[in-house]
């Protein structure tokens, strides 16, 4: 769809004649009637299949043609096509004499023909005007034409047809050639995707205007590429959403649950040990002069029992002091004044004279010992049970009673409770020091997750010891959240806290 | 050949709210060319659009009818719903989906057969 | 708000007879504009797309142009599948708007 347009110029008649030589009288009113038709090498009449449009009276004789786009598009003269603009046309342009008011040709004689000129040839959509003039005896014309496309024709041919749009169906301007050129921040064939914030993660983020990154579910931050983990995950991450994988020393499905309670709290004091022992639960050794649970007591010297052949010891601000019994001095009451003949050995000891009687050693008896073999002896001293087994003297030797989940000579072997899969229904095992937890699948509970879980998984009350519970409604599972000393799927187990 | 079918209520009362299926059969909802809307005709009287979206979940309504309504996506299951919320009796229609066409201006070139919804008590 | 308005809301054209059905709307000339033909108890059907784009299937006795203010459909020998409603269609933003329709019938 198109428009032929025709400019007129000037157009010469000096002597104000017809084409039949006849004069016109007083002068030649001059309108012009214009015919533009399909190519023909040689233009003969007959229909104008372009189209025809005619003028008004334009001036007398000899005049010059204003242009006049206002007054009904009169000059340049439009010819509007609507179909493909084939490159090719003829065009006829006659100028004849109106006697009167009446144009319509069958109102004016034969002889009111001035001048006919007939062109024909290529021409290409455009801008630019052609200019031509054509020339007979008595007159002359001037004019210039083009073809232009009509407003949303676009193309060589004006054969294209595109309409600028900014909505959801495209966000563009047309080209010259009636391609879509998107607008900033479009893309797309039909310019109707937004191009989003750069980064934005393909998959978990998406937009619907340009330089926005909207997530999906699941997803966070600024290009929708941190995942969001389970509700309620406390020291745990994810790299999926809704996982919770805990960070290292913290356990429980919500990573609420501390493993390592030393690195975390620091509870041991004045440079001890520290070590865990399971669930919110450690254990410290002392250095030399502490005692405590968290080695927070300075130990008194004289605990350590350094008077020795009965002295009685007294504490001091800058140590001690020992008060010894007769027959006995130095630092710790350490050496005697004692001879063989005082019978200085107790509980059967024999006494051997040293340094020519000035002094004396005693030889014990089996399980007496001290200088003056005054102590039993205790074979518990050197603490030989592991894993906080108990040591019982047993007359010339010791034993050790273990601890639940321990056994051995020295209780340094662990019993594996969960060596016979005590956890029913696929339930993950855990040893702990003083018995086992099974950690259930969804859908199940128990000690030993042999309870199913009903839907409403908390109505039951199924946690102990003032844990919090929690429904997964995504596995109609309760979880319970223990508090501090306790552990299992329902919180029933306490931790053996020193 | 892409086919849509609406499914739903067919009766619903005063202030609830209307959840209409629209699954595509025969072609990729998830697919570029198109957007999937909603229209909606009256007994015996002409076509008003309600809104549509795009496989994305960009959405476009009807401001007249914005406040109450939302259009939603499954990909998964190849099918889009349409929620419209406090419905009231000159709510009652024949309820339409179709397939907009980017490559036709966003011309409608497929439509449900429509459900019919009265709402009444 | 974008209003489209159809005339005449009724026409009775005889068989192999021309029918023009007219759509206007401000500067509906500048917006695509569809057409789309319901016979009573189906589903609408679309006969023209960008304002004058035949889709595959529909005759060419039905033709489209849009420029101006208005939008027309013609329907060049009316023929008895003919008769039904059509509803003209454009895109005012984002917002899907149809005229109020024209009931064409046989004369």
């Known amino acids: 769809s198109g428009v032929f347009q025709l400019q007129l110029q000037e157009f010469i008649n000096e002597r104000g004649v017809l084409a039949s030589g006849r004069p016109c009288e007083p002068g030649c009113r001059t309108f012009f009637r214009v015919c533009l038709k399909h190519f023909q090498a040689v233009v003969s009449p007959g229909p104008c299949t372009f189209g025809t449009v005619s003028t008004p009276v334009l001036g007398t004789n000899s005049f010059a043609v204003r242009d006049d786009s206002s007054g009904g598009g009169r000059n340049p003269l439009q010819l509007p096509f609507n179909f493909t603009w084939p490159g090719t046309f003829s065009l006829i342009i006659e100028a004849w004499h109106a006697p009167g008011d009446d144009l319509r040709p069958e109102a004016l004689p034969p002889d009111a023909l001035i001048s006919k000129i007939a062109i024909q040839g290529s021409l290409a959509v455009g801008q630019n005007w052609l200019l031509d003039e054509q020339t007979s005896t008595l007159t002359r014309l001037r004019y210039s034409y083009r073809v232009i496309c009509s407003d949303n024709y676009y193309g060589d041919n004006c054969s294209r047809l595109c309409k600028k749009r900014n909505d959801h169906f495209g966000h563009y301007v047309c080209q010259p050639d009636g391609n879509l050129s998107c607008l900033p921040g479009w893309t797309g064939e039909y310019c109707q995707q937004p191009i989003c914030l750069s980064g934005c993660h393909e998959q978990n983020g998406y937009c619907s205007k340009p330089a926005e990154c909207l997530c999906r579910p699941g997803w966070q931050g600024r290009l929708c590429n941190e995942c969001i983990p389970h509700n309620g995950c406390r020291h745990g991450t994810c790299s999926t959403p809704w996982q919770c994988t805990c960070d290292e020393g913290w356990g429980g499905l919500f990573c609420d649950q501390d493993l390592n309670y030393c690195t975390h709290h620091s509870p041991c004091k004045n440079g001890a040990t520290c070590s865990n022992s399971g669930q919110r639960s450690y254990t410290c050794t002392c250095r030399p002069g502490y005692t405590g649970v968290d080695c927070e007591l300075e130990l008194s010297e004289c605990d350590s029992n350094p008077c020795r052949n009965g002295g009685s010891c007294k504490d001091q601000e800058d140590g001690y002091h020992c008060l010894c019994p007769p027959g006995y001095y130095g630092l710790h009451c350490e050496h005697s004044t004692l001879s063989c003949a005082d019978s200085p050995c107790f509980n059967g000891g024999s006494c051997r004279e040293r340094n020519q009687g000035a002094n004396y050693a005693c030889e014990c008896p089996p399980n007496f010992t001290g200088s003056n073999c005054e102590k039993k002896v205790d074979r518990c001293t050197s603490n030989p049970c592991a894993n906080g087994g108990q040591c019982l003297n047993r007359g010339p030797s010791r034993m050790c009673r273990c601890r639940p989940g321990f056994t051995g000579t020295y209780c340094e072997l662990h019993v594996s409770d969960c060596a016979r899969n005590p956890c029913a229904h696929g339930g993950t095992c855990h040893d702990l020091e003083n018995g086992l937890m099974c950690t259930c699948p969804a859908g199940f509970s128990g000690r030993r997750c042999e309870v199913r879980t009903s839907i409403d998984a908390c109505a039951s009350s199924p946690c102990f010891n003032r844990a919090t519970c929690y429904t997964d409604l995504s596995t109609d599972t309760f979880v319970c959240n223990c508090p501090y000393g306790f552990v299992g799927s329902r919180c029933e187990f306490p931790v053996g806290l020193p | 050949e892409v086919t849509l079918r609406e499914s739903g209520p067919a009766l619903v009362k005063p202030t609830q709210t209307l959840t209409l299926t629209c699954t595509v059969s025969?072609?990729?909802?998830?697919?570029?060319?198109?957007?999937w809307g909603w229209i909606r005709q009256p007994p015996g009287k002409g076509l008003e659009w309600i809104g549509d979206?795009?496989?994305?979940?960009?959405?476009y309504y009807n401001p007249s009818l914005k406040s109450r309504v939302t259009i939603s996506v499954d990909t998964s299951k190849n099918q889009f719903v349409l929620t419209m919320t406090n419905m009231d009796p000159v709510d009652t229609a024949t309820y339409y989906c179709?397939?907009?066409?980017?490559?036709?201006?966003?011309?409608?070139?497929?439509w449900g057969q429509g459900t019919t919804v009265t709402v009444s008590s | 708000d974008y209003v489209l308005t159809q005339s005449p809301d009724s026409l009775a054209v005889s068989l192999g007879e021309r029918a023009t059905i007219n759509c206007s709307g401000q500067?509906?000339?500048?917006?695509?504009a569809s057409w789309y033909q319901q016979k009573p108890g189906q589903s609408p059907k679309l006969v023209i797309y960008e304002d004058s784009k035949r889709p595959s299937g529909i005759p060419d006795r039905f033709s489209g142009s849009n420029s101006g203010d208005d939008a027309t459909l013609t329907i060049s020998s009316l023929q008895a599948e003919d008769v039904a409603v059509y509803y003209c269609q454009a895109w005012d933003r984002d917002t899907g708007v149809f005229g109020g329709g024209t009931k064409v019938e046989i004369k």
């Open positions: 500067r509906l000339g500048d917006k695509y």
């Open positions: 179709a397939r907009q066409a980017l490559a036709m201006g966003g011309g409608s070139d497929k």
């Open positions: 025969g072609g990729s909802i998830s697919s570029s060319s198109y957007y």
């Open positions: 979206i795009y496989y994305t979940g960009s959405t």
